[in-house]
């Protein structure tokens, strides 16, 4: 009985943009101004959002679709549809409670945004350090120090590794 | 409805002074860190300062270091700026921020932003 009454529901032939007018025997009715729908067999229709102060407006909101907001230049959007402004640091810095610090020696961040990381290790790859790091930049790992022994060339590739107990041909 | 309002601003001399208030609503004010925030005339927004839950711990850009003192009285639901030896370059519309849920854990966000309070500085 409860699928055969929603399969007859006048509601749900209201698309998106409308909504379903209980006082106008369920006639599907425009959202109202400042209001959407973003989905059909609405009954009502929501609020959309108001980007203030701070919070800019990067997209309108039109009757199928909510207002979407940013951040004023300086901060930058974080959480779920930009719920928060949080401020921008430098290259070269993160964000603490006391405001934006240089990353300490060994770490760097290239971004305006998040944590300095470490630099890459290159040893662990068995690389060397070709260009340093910076706070803004991560070292370039260049060819493994093997490789730039003299008569080496640079630009040839390592020779593939034999398997143990195979004697070169 | 949460809700931020400054007051205080105005016209000032160069070295004067001026005290920023922000009155909180609609929240347990005591469970949040609380920010001052600037946006001088043509520029981005900028951090000015924060202070701890229950006050304990307060920070400033260094432009307003040893010049400018936040506080907060948790029995009124009020934040403060004490703001002395004001320059030009003070010149700029303050909003009071509360931080975020996850504020100094995951991140530094602030959710509720009051319309701003303008300070200008000038002879």
């Known amino acids: 009985f409860e699928r055969t009454r929603s399969l007859q529901d006048p509601c749900s032939n209201c698309p998106a943009g409308t909504f379903c007018d209980n006082n106008r025997n369920q006639i599907c009715s425009p959202c109202p101004p400042n209001s959407f729908s973003s989905a059909g067999g609405q009954r009502t229709c929501d609020i959309c959002r108001q980007c203030k102060g701070v919070f800019r407006t990067r997209k309108e909101c039109s009757s199928t679709s909510n207002a979407e907001c940013d951040c004023t230049p300086g901060f930058h959007c974080l959480g779920a549809g930009c719920s928060m402004c949080e401020q921008d640091c430098k290259q070269g810095q993160e964000l603490t409670k006391k405001g934006c610090k240089d990353c300490c020696f060994g770490t760097f961040n290239d971004q305006k945004r998040g944590i300095c990381r470490p630099w890459t290790n290159c040893s662990l790859d068995g690389k060397s350090v070709l260009v340093n790091g910076t706070k803004e930049r991560d070292v370039v790992c260049g060819p493994s120090p093997a490789d730039l022994s003299p008569g080496a060339s640079s630009v040839t590739p390592p020779a593939p590794a034999r398997e143990p107990g195979h004697s070169p041909q | 409805e949460v809700q931020l309002v400054e007051s205080g601003g105005g016209l000032v001399q160069p070295g004067g002074s001026l005290r920023l208030s922000c009155a909180a609503s609609g929240f347990t004010f005591s469970s949040y860190w609380m920010n001052w925030v600037r946006q001088a005339p043509g520029k981005g927004l900028e951090w000015v300062a924060n202070?701890?839950?229950?006050?304990?711990?307060?920070y400033y850009v260094d432009s307003v270091k040893g010049r400018f003192t936040i506080s907060r009285d948790n029995a009124k639901n009020s934040l403060y700026l004490q703001m002395n030896s004001l320059r030009a370059e003070d010149t700029a519309v303050y909003y009071c921020?509360?931080?975020?849920?996850?504020?100094?854990?995951?991140?530094?966000?602030?959710?509720?932003w009051g319309q701003g309070t303008t300070v200008t500085v000038s002879s």
């Open positions: 921020a509360r931080g975020g849920d996850s504020y100094g854990y995951r991140d530094y966000g602030m959710d509720v």
């Open positions: 202070i701890k839950e229950d006050g304990s711990e307060k």
